[in-house]
């Protein structure tokens, strides 16, 4: 077992205050993916709704890096290389499951954190709404 | 606090053998999702690499249901309606984290596990390859 | 199999510039789901980390605050390789550079391929 | 910058011998961005183990790692020769911040 030392003010999991809290074990169990994934390829630059990355980073939360998807364009990229702007690049978005630190600096401690990501883009149909 | 049943064989948060653990809290806080967040619109079907969603359910997960993103065609749906096969529909894929009951059936132990989800599908021009 | 080669002259005079180059094998130098690295050693500093590239959309540069204001790392995706330019060196710059592959998972960072390893020494 | 001390400095064993090595951060760092590596002289770094306590692929399951938090240990659960050599725990907080132990020599005694 580990010897984790006990910080003054960090929860202990024998206080019936400890709110829905469980016992994680932290060895990741890779169920289908292996441990060097490939992300989608370069479906970012090939998309007709194409998306950069940009680096969305906090040291205190588990992962501390995610890579956000922004669409380039309000259009998709048409066969030509053009923007047809009678369609739409839209992000797609995900819901993921994060870990913190709390109470911060606890080693031993951490709250589950749901935040929405956006993964990449797809081109869309517009929603046309007729004025009377 | 919630009363947590002891079932017989699952480990205890004061077992020295317990593999690296720690406490999480399942108080889940959103950080910037609604807790029910429009799931992507209805983007799967107004894409032009529209998708079905599939129920992936495990009650031995959290979450115990996710939705899995399968791309209907090959090719693209054009403005006509007609799928254009020189192009590709390809599932996004992202890496979430997610728990799961380890021992089984234990309401208060868990192991965090990786999974490889597809979120939704965009349209991209194929690469070719050209035979010598 | 994924490979490293370094490559580089092993002496340089105070005040110039160390140029080192690791070509790959086996992975692209724009992969999206590894960092490209340099790495030093010596007997005063241990290893210490200098800085990454990365491709994700765009190139991402992360340098050591250590040497931010010396240092280039450089793609080169026509060649498959990357380069280390370090400014300014001083007989301290003296040490074993590495090039390593550092898997950039999102939920896991290590470096699991390095360079065969090349002794600068700064010297006039 | 995250400062992580091993301990001991040189540890002096015997072939059989199982042998512990400590790694402390200054501060609290992610388990799952916590690393070892093994270095013989002469040598690159190879990897033994990522995220605190995975097996790096063709690594012999003598070699375990553990910890969280701030401390953190890497076993090996019986020397063979060919472990003798320096080994170094490193750590990846941040993108900036990515640090390396000084080391621990295990030497046969």
């Known amino acids: 077992g580990i010897a984790i030392p006990r910080n003054s003010g960090c929860p202990n999991s024998e206080d019936k205050n400890f709110p829905r809290t469980v016992m994680v074990n932290l060895n990741i169990h890779n169920r289908n993916t292996s441990t060097n994934p490939k992300r989608s390829s370069d479906y970012y630059n090939r998309s007709t709704s194409p998306w950069n990355l940009h680096r969305n980073e906090d040291p205190e939360r588990y992962p501390s890096v995610i890579w956000e998807a922004k669409c380039r364009h309000l259009g998709c990229v048409k066969a030509d290389g053009n923007v047809d702007y009678h369609m739409n690049s839209v992000p797609i978005q995900q819901e993921i499951l994060v870990l913190r630190r709390e109470p911060r600096h606890c080693p031993n401690s951490f709250r589950l954190e749901k935040i929405l990501v956006s993964v990449g883009c797809t081109c869309v149909t517009p929603i046309v709404h007729h004025v009377a | 606090g919630i009363a947590i049943p002891r079932n017989s064989g699952c480990p205890n948060s004061e077992d020295k053998n317990f593999p690296r653990t720690v406490m999480v809290n399942l108080n889940i806080h959103n950080r910037n999702t609604s807790t029910n967040p429009k799931r992507s619109s209805d983007y799967y079907n107004r894409s032009t690499s529209p998708w079905n969603l599939h129920r992936n359910e495990d009650p031995e997960r959290y979450p115990s249901v996710i939705w899995e993103a399968k791309c209907r065609h090959l090719g693209c749906v054009k403005a006509d309606g007609n799928v254009d096969y020189h192009m590709n529909s390809v599932p996004i894929q992202q890496e979430i984290l997610v728990l799961r009951r380890e021992p089984r059936h234990c309401p208060n132990s868990f192991r965090l596990e990786k999974i490889l989800v597809s979120v939704g599908c965009t349209c991209v021009t194929p690469i070719v390859h050209h035979v010598a | 199999q994924v490979q490293l080669q370094q490559s580089g002259p092993g002496l340089v005079k105070p005040s110039q510039t160390l140029s080192l180059t690791c070509a790959i094998s086996?992975?692209?130098?724009?992969?999206?789901?590894?960092?490209w690295g340099w790495i030093r050693q010596s007997p005063g500093r241990g290893l210490e980390w200098l800085g990454r590239i990365s491709y994700r959309s765009k190139w991402y540069n992360d340098y050591a605050v250590s040497v931010k204001s010396r240092i280039t790392i450089n793609p080169d995706t026509s060649k498959n390789q990357f380069s280390l330019q370090l400014n300014s060196v001083t007989p301290e710059d003296t040490a074993v550079y590495y090039c390593a592959r550092e898997v950039d998972s999102m939920y896991y960072s290590y470096f699991d391929i390095w360079g065969q390893g090349t002794l600068v020494t700064v010297s006039s | 910058d995250i400062v992580l001390t091993q301990s001991p400095a040189t540890l002096s064993l015997s072939p059989g011998e199982r042998a512990t090595l400590s790694c402390r951060a200054s501060?609290?760092?992610?388990?799952?961005?916590l690393a070892w590596y093994q270095q013989k002289p002469g040598q690159a770094p190879r990897l033994l183990i990522y995220?605190?306590?995975n097996r790096a692929t063709g690594v012999p399951a003598r070699f375990s790692g553990s910890g969280s938090g701030t401390d953190f240990t890497l076993t090996i659960s019986s020397l063979e020769p060919e472990d003798f050599a320096t080994y170094y725990c490193?750590?990846?907080?941040?993108?900036?911040?990515?640090?390396f132990g000084q080391g621990t020599k295990v030497e046969i005694k």
């Open positions: 086996g992975d692209s130098v724009s992969s999206s789901s590894a960092a």
């Open positions: 995220g605190a306590s």
């Open positions: 490193q750590q990846y907080r941040s993108t900036l911040s990515l640090t």
């Open positions: 501060q609290n760092v992610w388990a799952f961005y």
